[in-house]
C-alpha cells in the first residue's frame, strides 16, 4: 500500500480524504489511527459514528474530526490547529468486527510557519492537541500536554 504524503502548516487545518469501494465497505465504520512504529500498533485517534447510517455526522476527538460519505465512498478527516506533534504516519481504516482493513496510509508532515517567531527548537504540543481514544491524558506543569499511546493495536 503506497503512502500518501500530505503537508500542513502549523496552526492551520489539514484535510485528508480517503476513498474506498462503497459497495465492498457497505455497513462498515471507518477509523483514523496513528502508527506508533514501523511494525508497531496503530493507536486509534477517532472513528465514525457507532450507527453506520449516521456516519455522515462529524465525530470529533480533540482537534481531529472524521465524517464518512458512505454513498460516495469517501471518509474525510480534518486535523484542526495542526501542531508539530501531529506529524506522523496515519492509517484510514475500515472496521469489520475486530478486524481493521487499511484503506490508505498517510504521512502527515507539519511545517513551521517561517514568519512565526516562535522557537522552532521547542516543539511543544499545546493544550488543544488531540487526545486518543481510550488514552489517558495527563497535564504536565509546562504548557504542553503529554498524550499517551497505549500499546493496544
Amino acid at each position: 500500500l503506497n503512502t500518501t504524503v500530505l503537508q500542513g502548516m502549523a496552526g492551520q487545518s489539514l484535510r485528508v480524504s480517503c476513498t474506498y469501494d462503497a459497495l465492498k465497505h457497505w455497513g462498515r465504520r471507518k477509523a483514523w489511527c496513528r502508527q506508533l512504529g514501523e511494525e508497531g500498533p496503530c493507536q486509534r485517534v477517532v472513528s465514525t459514528h457507532g450507527v453506520w447510517l449516521l456516519a455522515f455526522l462529524k465525530k470529533r476527538n480533540g482537534s481531529t474530526v472524521i465524517a464518512d460519505d458512505t454513498l460516495a465512498g469517501t471518509v474525510t478527516i480534518t486535523l484542526k490547529n495542526l501542531q508539530a506533534g501531529d506529524a506522523g504516519l496515519y492509517q484510514c481504516q475500515s472496521l469489520r468486527g475486530r478486524e481493521a482493513e487499511v484503506l490508505q496510509k498517510v504521512l502527515v508532515e507539519v511545517l513551521e510557519d517561517p514568519l512565526d517567531d516562535q522557537d522552532a527548537g521547542d516543539l511543544w504540543v499545546p493544550e488543544e492537541s488531540s487526545s486518543f481514544e481510550g488514552a489517558q491524558v495527563e497535564h504536565s506543569t509546562s504548557r504542553n500536554q503529554e498524550t499517551s499511546f497505549p500499546p493496544t493495536s
Epitope: 503512502t3 504524503v5 503537508q7 502508527q35 506508533l36 512504529g37 514501523e38 508497531g40 508539530a84 506533534g85 506529524a87 506522523g88 504516519l89 504521512l107 502527515v108 508532515e109 507539519v110 511545517l111 513551521e112 522552532a120 527548537g121 521547542d122 516543539l123 511543544w124 504540543v125 489517558q136 491524558v137 495527563e138 497535564h139 504536565s140 506543569t141 509546562s142 504542553n144 503529554e146 498524550t147 499517551s148 499511546f149 497505549p150 500499546p151
Partner: antibody, heavy 119, light 107 residues
Framework: EVQLVESGGGLVQPGRSLKLSCAAS????????MAWVRQAPTKGLEWVAS????????YYRDSVKGRFTLSRDNAKSTLYLQMDSLRSEDTATYYC????????????WGQGVMVTVSS | NIVMTQSPKSMSLSVGDRVTMNCKAS??????LAWYQQKPGQSPKLLLY???NRFTGVPDRFTGGGYGTDFTLTINSVQAEDAAFYYC?????????FGGGTKLELK
C-alpha cells in the same frame, strides 16, 4: 536492509566549519524524518537536530542553533549537517539517525563519524 | 527542558539474573519514552518505544514499564550479549532528551 553511512568528519580548529553527509539506503528516504544525535567521548547521547521528510522544517537544540544547518537531498537520499563556528564542546561522534514519523525516537542509526574540534 | 535521570549508574550481574533499571523524568511524560542499548564500540540500537513496544528483532526478555515520571527496563534472564549501556529517552515532544545511561556489566 536500512543503512545509514556517515562521512565528512575529522579534526578542525575552533571557529572553522565542517560538513557531514549521511547516505541512506534500504528505505524510501523522502518518507522519513531524519536527525543527527551526537555523543561526546565517554559521555551520553545528545539530540542535535531534526528535519521533516521534505526538508520543509528543521529543529535544533539550543546550543547549535544559528551555527548548524541541517538539510537533505531526497533525490540523492542524502542528509547533510553543515557545522559552522565550531567549538571544542562540539567534539563528539555524530550519528545519522532515522526518526520515526516525527515521534522523536530513532529507529535506525549509522555507524557514526568523529568530529574533533581542537587547536 | 525535561531532565531524564537514570539509576543505577552501573550494575554487575550474572548470566541468568533478572535486572531492572530505572529512568525518572523531571515532569510527566505520559508513556512517551524509548530505550536504547549501546554496546562498546557500537552505535546505539532502539529497544523499546512508547514505553513497552519492542522494536523489530528485540528479544522478548526485554520489557518496559511505567507511566508519567517513573519508568523501568527489565531484562529477564540476562545473557552475556546484554552487557552494554542502556539509555532512556523522552520522545514525542521535543527537545528529545536522553538519560545519562546505565552500564550493565556481567560477572
Amino acid at each position: 536492509e536500512v543503512q545509514l553511512v556517515e562521512s565528512g568528519g575529522g579534526l578542525v580548529q575552533p571557529g572553522r566549519s565542517l560538513k557531514l553527509s549521511c547516505a541512506a539506503s534500504g528505505f524510501t528516504f523522502s518518507n522519513y524524518y531524519m536527525a543527527w544525535v551526537r555523543q561526546a567521548p565517554t559521555k551520553g547521547l545528545e539530540w542535535v537536530a531534526s528535519l521533516t521528510n521534505s526538508g520543509g522544517s528543521t529543529y535544533y537544540r539550543d546550543s547549535v542553533k544559528g551555527r548548524f544547518t541541517l538539510s537533505r537531498d531526497n533525490a540523492k537520499s542524502t542528509l547533510y549537517l553543515q557545522m559552522d563556528s565550531l567549538r571544542s564542546e562540539d567534539t563528539a561522534t555524530y550519528y545519522c539517525t532515522r526518526e520515526w514519523a516525527g515521534s522523536g525516537y530513532f529507529d535506525y542509526w549509522g555507524q557514526g563519524v568523529m568530529v574533533t574540534v581542537s587547536s | 527542558n525535561i531532565v531524564m535521570t537514570q539509576s543505577p549508574k552501573s550494575m554487575s550481574l550474572s548470566v541468568g539474573d533478572r535486572v531492572t533499571m530505572n529512568c525518572k523524568a523531571s515532569q510527566n511524560v505520559g508513556n512517551n519514552l524509548a530505550w536504547y542499548q549501546q554496546k562498546p564500540g557500537q552505535s546505539p540500537k532502539l529497544l523499546l518505544y512508547y514505553t513497552s513496544n519492542r522494536f523489530t528483532g528485540v528479544p522478548d526478555r526485554f520489557t518496559g514499564g511505567g507511566y508519567g515520571t517513573d519508568f523501568t527496563l527489565t531484562i529477564n534472564s540476562v545473557q552475556a550479549e546484554d552487557a552494554a549501556f542502556y539509555y532512556c529517552q523522552r520522545i514525542y515532544n521535543s527537545p528529545w532528551t536522553f538519560g545519562g545511561g546505565t552500564k550493565l556489566e556481567l560477572k
